[in-house]
Amino acid sequence: YDFTNCDFQKIEADYLRTISKDLITYMSGTKSTDFNNTVSCSNRPHCLTEIQSLTFNPTPRCASLAKEMFARKTKATLALWCPGYSETQINATQAMKKARKSKVTTNKCLEQVSQLLGLWRRFIRTLLKKQ
């Protein structure tokens, strides 16, 4: 999916209002220095591309993120503010259904969500630079 035509301001507002709080709740008990950010993003479409991939692509060490509240809200936000996004997300929905039902938060999942927070923050910064 090409995120170029999204309403970035609306996505930013949704992130600041709800998604960020859910991410921080997920990370509660860990410090921002506990994990080393190894990925970043260049511009707004790039940030959303990587956020979507990191949120919804199960990885061998962390298969369960798509079931989390922040992931559901991310999906809803992208569907709302990115034209045609929901039609492209049938595979992502299947991945969510296959994701583990257990709510065990592994260290690798915490690390992945730490990366996600970094990507979202970069998204907000690139938005501020454009204004």
Epitope: T38, V39, S42, N57, T59, K129
Partner: antibody, heavy 117, light 108 residues
Framework: QVQLQESGPGLVKPSETLSLTCAVS?????????WSWIRQPPGKGLEWIGY???????SYNPSLKSRVTISRDTSKNQFSLKLSSVTAADTAVYYC??????????WGQGTLVTVSS | EIVMTQSPATLSLSPGERATLSCRAS??????LAWYQQKPGQAPRLLIY???SRATGIPARFSGSGSGTDFTLTISSLEPEDFAVYYC??????????FGQGTKVEIK
Amino acid sequence: QVQLQESGPGLVKPSETLSLTCAVSGYSISSGYGWSWIRQPPGKGLEWIGYFSYYGSTSYNPSLKSRVTISRDTSKNQFSLKLSSVTAADTAVYYCARTNLLYFDSWGQGTLVTVSS
Amino acid sequence: EIVMTQSPATLSLSPGERATLSCRASQSVSSNLAWYQQKPGQAPRLLIYDASSRATGIPARFSGSGSGTDFTLTISSLEPEDFAVYYCQQYSNWPQYSFGQGTKVEIK
């Protein structure tokens, strides 16, 4: 400390597919970062080809996108480049590199690929 | 596509002298710029990222400055091992990351 090592045929015929592999040691490619290919034609500058991230996203240079595939084999901790329908203009030193999806902080030593019949 | 133009193409200096290399972008790249050093037969090495942050293990004599379209790499006092080709790279315009054509710093 991460080390990267490119391997593959040094000579490819025009119209064929160039295939290279990058073996990574000292860091698991499924643990973090992105993993990229960059090339440098003889005596010229650098050109970014593409990357994949540790969580599976891929991104390619638009000028090469229709011909490029980057894939990974996590069991061997290596990743590969395939470039189809090559011409003499694809003759270059090909580098693999570790990236944070923006810039490139560790590089292989490079392998020269010549396209010629 | 953002075009990166480096100048001069060649810089002839003596050890101990100050080197000032320029990189200009065809449109603003904010601070999304990296500098690399490449010696003959070797891979490039990351020197500077985000226009002014030194990469791990890079000596303090290397410094970067600038934002928007004009950037500078300064080597405060050239050591014999600093004679090489230097490239700038913008990463503002995903998925079209681009490099400059290089500046060769040679011994005078």
